[in-house]
């Protein structure tokens, strides 16, 4: 008979995640060589730990600690772009701009981008059915804590003029409740972050408004000014700029060196 | 290295047409928006018009809005200004400029210009 | 439509510094570019992102962009800095626009 399993809101573990993780793990060491003294095997293992056999209710920063700890890494801190709800271009623009690094493009960020997890309590077993959704049923699941974790060390990480990319065709352009409103806006260090810059992006090609006035960039400006850290927005247009790079990345229009 | 060269201009009276060309070469020319921006004798710069990498996205200042029309041939890297129902406020010299990379929408290289005279 | 409001003219002892405003509402909103242009020249963009200068542009060239003005500053002019410079930014669509520009003499 087959035991009963707790049925979650969200999807369950994406397949073959072992195999993806430990996929992404040899891949990203080989094209980065700063990276290539990690084991991938006692990473997996270390990211197995975080979350099997336990309640996928009940995880901690704390189980997330010796993945972190394999993982550590190295990025110029003064090159750290942040997004919300713009992922897709943000990452494009990191594939061109070569000098600049989201989460996604570090060790960690990069094994769990699109994927989720889950195990269950008191068994080996990965839960590929269903996983716990963020607000129908805990916060503290593995996926959440992950990024939660690998986001505060992220922005923790970054130095002088850091960027944000955010999206100008939502409704909340900043929106306080992202992994950027409510972790990295809270966790830049002062005394190392001079700027944040925010780059709204416009979808319209007609769009001629003055995005960094709305009330919700207003909100993140007073956030940040709190925070002894200078804050500054620009309006960015034409998006389809990035989008042309991502085809010809080795184009010379994709390089902001003039 | 990056070469920009206008061509086409020259004297039209008023109400006449001209079509200006701008050859490009030393990039790739279908990786950029690329522009046209105009003076006028002893006067300061003012932009044209812009057309996106593929053409399928064109741009006016209202000044020439419904006379002109900017398009582009990548198979022959060049660029090209259509010129209608031409004034002598019209009359300047036309530059080819290409636009700058990403985030950034000003002008990294400019053609030497063509001279357009509108007059009778 | 934003305007861009330079002052019409300049003028810098050789080696002062020289200091070209560019002011429009909320222009901090919006990358600013600036171009050099010597009589019977094309223009040469000097700065681009309110403060990144091109290659093959001299150090002595840089830029800011706060509140409502952006400003070009040249340390230590020379003589071969006299030229025409304009202010530039891009608020969407076809708003494309230049400052009416500014003659820096060097005396």
């Known amino acids: 008979v087959p035991r009963w399993r707790q049925q979650w809101s969200g999807p369950g573990t994406t397949k073959r995640f072992p195999e993806t993780v430990l996929a992404r793990c040899v891949k990203y060491t080989e094209i980065h060589p700063e990276m290539r003294h990690v084991d991938c095997q006692s990473v997996w293992d270390a990211f197995k730990g975080a979350f099997i056999s336990k309640h996928p209710c009940n995880i901690t920063e704390e189980d997330y600690q010796p993945l972190m700890k394999l993982g550590t890494q190295t990025v110029p801190c003064n090159k750290i772009l942040l997004w919300s709800r713009i992922k897709d271009l943000a990452h494009q623009f990191t594939q061109v701009q070569r000098d600049m690094f989201t989460l996604e493009d570090t060790l960690l960020g990069y094994l769990a981008d699109d994927l989720t997890w889950c195990g269950e309590f008191n068994t080996s077993k990965i839960n590929y059915q269903s996983c716990p959704d963020w607000r129908k049923d805990c916060s503290n699941n593995p996926v959440s804590v992950f990024w939660k974790t690998v986001s505060r060390r992220f922005a923790e990480a970054a130095c002088d003029v850091v960027h944000v990319m955010l999206n100008g065709s939502r409704s909340k352009i900043f929106d306080k409740n992202s992994t950027f409103g409510s972790v990295e806006v809270h966790n830049l260090q002062p005394e190392k972050v001079q700027t944040l810059e925010a780059w709204v992006i416009h979808g319209g090609r007609e769009d001629s408004r003055d995005l960094c006035q709305d009330p919700t960039i207003k909100e993140l400006e007073s956030i940040i000014s709190k925070r002894n850290i200078q804050f500054s927005c620009k309006n960015i247009y034409r998006p389809d700029k990035f989008l042309q790079c991502v085809k010809n990345p080795e184009d010379s229009s994709c390089t902001s060196e003039i | 290295q990056v070469q920009l060269v206008e061509s086409g201009g020259g004297l039209v009276q008023p109400g006449g047409s001209l079509r200006l060309s701008c050859a490009a070469s030393?990039?790739?020319?279908?990786?950029?928006?690329m522009n046209w921006v105009r003076q006028a004798p002893g006067k300061g710069l003012e932009w044209v018009s812009a057309i996106s990498m593929h053409g399928d996205t064109t741009y006016y200042a209202d000044s020439v809005k419904g006379r002109f029309t900017i398009s582009r041939d990548n198979s022959k890297n060049t660029l090209y200004l259509q010129m209608n129902s031409l004034r002598a406020e019209d009359t300047a010299v036309y530059y080819c400029?290409?636009?700058?990379?990403?985030?950034?929408?000003?002008?990294?290289?400019w053609g030497q210009g063509t001279l357009v005279t509108v007059s009778s | 439509d934003i305007e861009l409001t330079q002052p019409p003219s300049v003028s810098v002892a050789p080696g002062q510094t020289a200091r070209i405003s560019c002011s429009g509402d909320?222009?901090?909103?919006?990358?600013v570019y600036w171009y050099q242009q010597k009589p019977g020249q094309a223009p040469v963009l000097v700065i681009y992102g309110d403060s990144k200068r091109p290659s093959g542009i001299p150090e002595r060239f840089s830029g800011s962009n706060s509140g409502n003005t952006a400003t070009l500053t040249i340390s230590g002019t020379q003589a071969e800095d006299e030229a025409d410079y304009y202010c530039q930014t891009y608020t969407g669509g076809a708003s494309l626009v230049f400052g009416g520009g500014t003659k820096l003499t060097v005396l």
């Open positions: 400029a290409r636009d700058l990379p990403l985030v950034y929408t000003g002008f990294a290289y």
């Open positions: 909320n222009l901090r909103h919006y990358y």
């Open positions: 030393g990039f790739t020319f279908s990786s950029y928006y």
